[in-house]
Amino acid sequence: ESALITQQDLAPQQRAAPQQKRSSPSEGLCPPGHHISEDGRDCISCKYGQDYSTHWNDLLFCLRCTRCDSGEVELSPCTTTRNTVCQCEEGTFREEDSPEMCRKCRTGCPRGMVKVGDCTPWSDIECVHKESGTKHSGEVPAVEETVTSSPGTPASPCSLSG
């Protein structure tokens, strides 16, 4: 059914914002890229580049597209069925306990430690003790300072993607 063609299926020049396409819900739900009307009779398409829905839903409104912060790069734009994908700029990473901002990666390891993992958008550089090979976690002293933290503490991996 033509009403179910979502705007990301169209060429950029065909993506007009004005009228939103409508179709009928299936068992009370609307397909990705749409939201349901107040009376539950229609599925209304999300606005390309502005909002989206990813699943079959009975949402009254589509969800607002994420806008990448400064310090982030846009990996893929928002479509009616998929949110924007943002990633930390090179040299910065997003930490699990502070996902709202990109933090600068350390430039080197503390004395007595050696780098075994590079800076990625999801994790800081990884340092291990030269002798024991134990990962270092927690607050890191400046590169030239001596490490005083206990070597037995495991590092917390970072798996968050922007």
Epitope: I36, G40, D58, L59, L60, F61, C62, R64, E100
Partner: nanobody
Amino acid sequence: EVQLLESGGGLVQPGGSLRLSCAASGRAASDYAMSWFRQAPGKGLEFVSAINWGGEDTVYADSVKGRFTISRDNSKNTLYLQMNSLRAEDTAVYYCAAAPSFSRSVLDGNLSQIDYWGQGTLVTVSS
């Protein structure tokens, strides 16, 4: 984290008007859909109206259609409820609420989807 603070409640005569405001603070408050609910004395929470993040899509409970108007000003991070032709049965504490969106079940009082609530403002309609 979004904080919501309502204001504008008070005593008004039947047939009168009142405008409620809800100031939102916190990161990305304008990304949220916003809603008004109310709780009359001795009753449960009732859906009043909702508005999408951009302010162009609105939904109303049948009991307030044609009398109440919801709007928002994202530059001020503020939600409004213009209430006209007020009736005694509109007497309640009015709460604003925020969520990324609302499912249709919110119209029937499903509140599990609400992420943030305000403290409420009392509206009394009496002569």
